[in-house]
Amino acid sequence: HTAAQDNCTCPTNKMTVCSPDGPGGRCQCRALGSGMAVDCSTLTSKCLLLKARMSAPKNARTLVRPSEHALVDNDGLYDPDCDPEGRFKARQCNQTSVCWCVNSVGVRRTDKGDLSLRCDELVRTHHILIDLRHRPTAGAFNHSDLDAELRRLFRERYRLHPKFVAAVHYEQPTIQIELRQNTSQKAAGDVDIGDAAYYFERDIKGESLFQGRGGLDLRVRGEPLQVERTLIYYLDEIPPKFSMKRLTA
């Protein structure tokens, strides 16, 4: 569904301003911060969401080992530059003219430089590893049940096609969800794994981006699945370029 016509809100993004000023008086929603029109029938891009967040008031064994090229978002929040489609621009700079290159999920993939830094292309993050630790339960979850419910969650809540959920690993209390999506696999209209992972991350933190929906309440055969910590690793189609100084720090 598009923006809800009756009360003109955006079901998939509460960080919007909506008004019935679209064609034929239809409800149209614009992201805070950028003012860009968003499609409320799908997830909003992470770049627009980060920009909106920065503009908002501040109060408002079988397990996979991440590869040596995996990135973790250690830099935290920044006010990104987004292209007209809402994607991250390959080069990001702050107010003090410090610049760096980012991948398609907006995570820095080079050392920081000055305005002369070149970022030739936006490198795609094609593999995301979401590493969760759940709170203690009476017993371990059944792996097959867990797989079924997490797939359902990504399919139903984030509209991510099941083929992009590559695997769900479980070794109590650690759950790992692998999302994979190459450039060639992503068709028009497909939700991006980076956007799905970001919505999931915010849901897990109790900061749902959905309008009016309750927070994430995930249960497996009636047993609540409560997450106590999350780590997300990002793997790019082209390995990141950091100096040895950073790697040995």
């Epitope: 792996h143 079924a148 399919r155 695997a167 009636g222």
Partner: antibody
Framework: QVQLQESGPGLVKPSQTLKLTCTVS?????????WNWIRQPPGKGLEWIGY???????LYNPSLKSRVTISRDTSKNQFSLKLSSVTAADTAVYYC??????????WGQGTLVTVSS | DIQMTQSPSSLSASVGDRVTITCRAS??????????LHWYQQKPGKAPKLLIY???NLESGVPSRFSGKGSGTDFTLTISSLQPEDFATYYC?????????FGQGTKLEIK
């Protein structure tokens, strides 16, 4: 033992709204699982209509989405189906069923709804 | 939508026969640890009854003469030795993608 029981009118006029209720006993619908409606036209196969989850989230079959609403009343441990603008093609046996982890382990006995003037 | 195709559409067999019904999905319904394919039995005037879930798991209370196997797109339901109460219509169902979809059914009749 979990039991599901459908109830509602057996005859609905074309263009009207079909309303059915499923009463669940032996399990609280807000404690877990997904609570579904499935239908079967006479002599034909099964068609999934949609569900409401333990937390109140909905998912509908896109082929019926514009006409379907599934809601719940947790105080009565019931969930309901509304199907608007019905035609003769909506004549079917309507089942409610529990979806455990994406398969249906408990079913109601079904109720036949005929759409006719 | 994922299309589920069962074969044969109908089948005549005798008590004691071994019978196999096939279900083919238009795309894979398997994950790394799951096969989202389930089998149901339906008798006239009754609700479907779950027989096998996730391709090969026998539902509690279902006789061991029923078995299922397969992965990806191709699945089978086998009844090792038909009993009189087994004459019914059988449906497969996928739950890898929404909307959930069922096969058209296989009617098992007495020869």
């Amino acid at each position: 033992q979990v039991q599901l029981q459908e109830s509602g009118p057996g005859l609905v006029k074309p263009s009207q709204t079909l309303k059915l209720t499923c009463t669940v006993s032996g399990y609280s619908i807000s404690s877990g699982y997904y609570w579904n409606w499935i239908r079967q036209p006479p002599g034909k196969g099964l068609e999934w209509i949609g569900y409401i989850s333990y937390s109140g989230r909905n998912l509908y079959n896109p082929s019926l989405k514009s006409r379907v609403t599934i809601s719940r009343d947790t105080s009565k441990n019931q969930f309901s189906l509304k199907l608007s603008s019905v035609t003769a093609a909506d004549t079917a046996v309507y089942y409610c069923a529990r979806d455990t982890t994406a398969y249906f382990d408990y079913w109601g006995q079904g109720t036949l709804v005929t759409v006719s003037s | 939508d994922i299309q589920m195709t069962q074969s044969p559409s109908s089948l005549s067999a005798s008590v004691g026969d071994r019978v196999t019904i096939t279900c083919r999905a238009s795309e894979s319904v398997s994950s790394s640890v799951n096969r989202f394919l389930h089998w149901y039995q339906q008798k006239p005037g009754k609700a479907p009854k779950l027989l096998i879930y996730r391709a090969s798991n026998l539902e509690s209370g279902v006789p061991s003469r029923f078995s299922g196997k397969g992965s990806g797109t191709d699945f089978t339901l086998t009844i090792s030795s038909l009993q009189p109460e087994d004459f019914a219509t059988y449906y497969c169902q996928q739950s890898n993608e929404d909307p959930y979809t069922f096969g058209q059914g296989t009617k098992l009749e007495i020869k």
